[in-house]
């Protein structure tokens, strides 16, 4: 094997150059340092076959498989993948090694498999085998970001321990309330892990990857704002970091801020202060209280005091395990056809929940809004007045919660009829559930007033279609009514509907539909 060339195989992961959500740009801006894939001679193979270490790639990532050949003279080559071939253009690097690359853009499962590179040099022929697979998405995680103080700097680092590595961004807003909604012009986004500008009104950090987006808000007490009617409450699990920011603005610098836990000053090393002048020359001070890893005894009332402002407190509760508190009893609603109505669930939860609304096996996005009293609310209004069973499902890392709702729409019955050789049946989904009458139409009763009571079998709510009750009535055929027209009528407090059927007709034969209010 003296003549065999020296082969080096490397993997280059392309850095994503675009910051938009779900975007995997198709070309490399900056490359991570190449990863050596070994490329050992494969034993017991016919011909000379080098095998590179297996490569695992995230869905939609872009990579380059590269071979460096230290062999004299020119080389020619061909890539083969799944019976398709691709010409390759070898070039030479500064060390005069032949370089052959296969760039795979926006990786998909279809592009996973064995890539064979056939190389012909003046001295010998050989094959290089790369096996590329998609990283198992079951191993993907997306964890809520948390904050750390940057060493020796007045800055916060946002960390999310997620796979694949998430894109981290700070979401900043200097307005109050509604205008700090995600898409508001008042919102500024900074795609970086470190934040130095910590004086803003509303500061959140968000992390996003394949699995979605998770955000954490920097808990803030603003001494210039009127305190909430209920004491703000912050939940944390044992071991999580605690960060509370106290913010105050005053006409001059002659004021100071302090933190106390249950009337005891925080120890040094558990707080740090920053100050700046605002545009109108007023002084803004912020004082952070932080604990890198909370224990049960960090529970209590944290009070921020100022020499020039009324003090304000927050209750910090440390729990062993996450929770979702809400009433899970099922609720039934009855509304008119054009009445505006929303389902709503009020809950208290930590960590923040992920939730869905489900109707007829279809899931709908779930929005949640924080209330001032520490509770959150999720509303669902997109029912389009469809009666049935609606399900609210919420979960976080530690708890699950499901609540059922039934929606009934008040409306007059609508009748569908079908007939077979032995019986006629009518169905209605009006609400309240209708009652039934059957009438026979004959020479004696051209207006179909002769009531039929024999052989009638009513089934109220015989089948539940996605929670929607259906009522039916069946008339068994007798000689007395064979060949006649019969009429089934369904009625409730909102009106009556009828359907006329010719008995003894082949197959379903709804004849005339009468709508009688």
């Amino acid at each position: 094997n003296q003549d065999l060339p020296v082969i080096k195989c490397v993997l280059i992961n392309h850095k994503n150059n675009d910051s938009s959500v779900g975007k995997s740009s198709s070309y490399p801006m900056v490359s991570e340092s190449p990863e050596d894939l070994g490329c050992a001679l494969r034993p017991q193979s016919s011909g000379t076959v080098y095998e590179a270490a297996a490569v695992e790639v995230d869905v939609s990532a872009s990579i380059t498989l590269q071979v460096l050949v230290d062999a004299p003279g020119n080389i020619s080559c061909l890539w083969v993948f799944k019976h398709s071939s691709l010409n390759c253009q070898p070039h030479f690097d500064l060390q005069n090694r032949g370089v052959v690359s296969m760039v795979i853009l926006k990786m998909t499962e279809t592009q996973a498999g064995e890539y064979l590179l056939f190389i012909q040099s003046e001295a010998t022929n050989y094959t290089i085998l790369f096996t590329v697979s998609i990283r198992n998405t079951l191993l993907y995680t997306l964890r809520r970001p948390y904050f750390r103080k940057m060493e020796n700097q007045d800055a916060l680092v946002c960390i999310s321990e997620s796979v694949p590595e998430p894109i981290v961004e700070w979401v900043l807003c200097d307005s109050q309330g509604e205008s700090c909604k995600e898409e508001s012009p008042a919102v500024v986004k900074k795609e970086e892990k470190v934040l130095h500008e910590l004086f803003g009104t509303d500061i959140r950090c968000c992390a996003r990857n394949e699995l979605g987006r998770e955000c954490t808000r920097l808990f803030t007490i603003d001494l210039n704002q009127t305190p909430q009617t209920t004491l703000p409450q912050l939940f944390l699990k044992v071991g999580e970091p605690l960060w509370i920011r106290c913010k105050a603005v005053h006409v001059n610098h002659g004021f100071g801020l302090t933190w106390e836990l249950e009337n005891k000053a925080l120890e040094e090393g558990n707080y740090f202060e920053m100050s700046t002048y605002s545009t109108n020359r007023t002084m803004i001070r912020i004082l952070f209280a932080f604990v890198s890893s909370v224990a049960r005894n960090d529970t209590g009332y944290y009070t921020c005091s100022s020499s020039k402002h009324p003090s304000q407190s927050a209750l910090v509760t440390i729990v062993e395990k996450g929770f979702i508190n809400a009433t899970n009893s099922s609720e039934d609603y009855e509304i008119d056809q054009y009445e505006e109505f929303c389902f709503s669930v009020r809950f208290k939860a930590y960590p923040q929940i992920r939730c869905t609304w489900t109707f007829s096996r279809k899931s709908f996005p779930c929005e949640q809004k924080g209330l001032d009293n520490g509770y959150s609310i999720s509303k669902f209004c997109n029912h389009k007045h469809q009666p049935g069973e609606y399900i609210f499902h919420a979960e976080n890392d530690d708890a699950q919660f499901t609540k059922m709702f039934t929606l009934n729409i008040r409306r007059k019955p609508q009748v569908l009829a079908e007939a077979s050789a032995s019986q006629a049946s009518c169905f209605s989904d009006g609400y309240p559930l209708p009652s039934w009458t059957w009438k026979k139409c004959s020479d004696k009763s051209p207006n179909c007033t002769e009531e039929i009571t024999e052989g009638v079998w009513n089934r109220k709510a015989n089948r539940k279609v996605f929670g929607q009750w259906v009522s039916s009535s069946t008339l068994n055929m007798s000689e007395a009514i064979k060949g006649f027209l019969v009429k089934c009528c369904a009625y409730n407090s909102l009106g009556t509907s009828c359907e006329t059927i010719l008995l003894n007709s082949p197959g379903p034969f709804p004849f005339i539909q009468d709508n009688i209010s």
């Epitope: 779900g22 975007k23 198709s26 869905v59 380059t64 070039h91 853009l105 998909t108 592009q111």
Partner: antibody, heavy 119, light 111 residues
């Protein structure tokens, strides 16, 4: 064999939205990008964007952000593009296409869906 | 965005002769020596049809009369010899950088 079958021509009013479907047969869309291309007479071909149905991941041409959104239903092997707030500029033939194994070059195309926006 | 400029805009060639269409990119469409330039043929009322992928690879089922060459910013599609069935508009397309872009097209006619 691989085929992409698009929904029929649409005549729409300005301001309305339209949803075009692209049903694939002969392969599974979940692990292949589906590209969407616009063609207007005299304007050549324009890439609108793409979706990878299995992951729901989508990439948009900045020019069409807010105009086009992509969805897919892997159970019916169908991809969709929705065009919103239609204007006469959106009158065009829209194609779906599948990139080949080596990426970027589109080897299978739908027959195209003509969208006409007129009041 | 990468702008692709095709020339000529239209081309008339005699049957059996060579047709050459050029496509110039406003920046390189190569990544590690891989050229992400592709060529399509489109006839009226039909979708485009892939002829050449990654600069020089002939799509399966396409006659060998079609060939592609070039790298970085300059690419060429050659049809030799031209047949009557080749009357169509030809487009180049790059996929090296989002957004993918197409050339303005070259209309091929028979002299």
């Amino acid at each position: 064999q691989v085929q992409l079958q698009q929904s029929g021509a649409e005549l729409m009013k300005p301001g309305a939205s339209v949803k075009i479907s692209c049903k694939a047969t002969g392969y599974t869309i979940s692990s292949n990008w589906i590209e969407w291309i616009k063609q207007r007479p005299g304007h050549g071909l324009e890439w609108i964007g793409e979706i990878l149905p299995g992951s729901g991941r989508a990439n948009n041409n900045e020019k069409f952000k807010g105009k086009a959104s992509f969805t897919a239903d892997t159970s019916s092997n169908t991809a969709y593009i929705q065009l919103s707030s239609l204007t006469s500029e959106d009158s065009a033939v829209y194609y779906c296409a599948r990139p080949n194994l080596f990426g970027g070059a589109m080897d299978y195309w739908g027959q195209g869906t003509s969208v006409t926006v007129s009041s | 965005d990468i702008v692709l400029t095709q020339s000529p805009a239209s081309l008339a060639v005699s049957l059996g002769q060579r047709a050459t269409i050029s496509c110039r990119a406003s920046e390189s469409v190569d990544t590690y020596g891989n050229s992400f330039m592709h060529w399509y043929q489109q006839k009226p009322g039909q979708p485009p049809k892939l002829l050449i992928y990654r600069a020089s690879n002939l799509e399966s089922g396409i006659p060998a009369r079609f060939s592609g060459s070039g790298s970085r910013t300059d690419f060429t599609l050659t049809i030799n010899p031209v047949e009557a069935d080749d009357v169509a508009t030809y487009y180049c397309q790059q996929s090296n950088k989002d957004p993918w872009t197409f050339g303005g097209g070259t209309k091929l006619e028979i002299k």
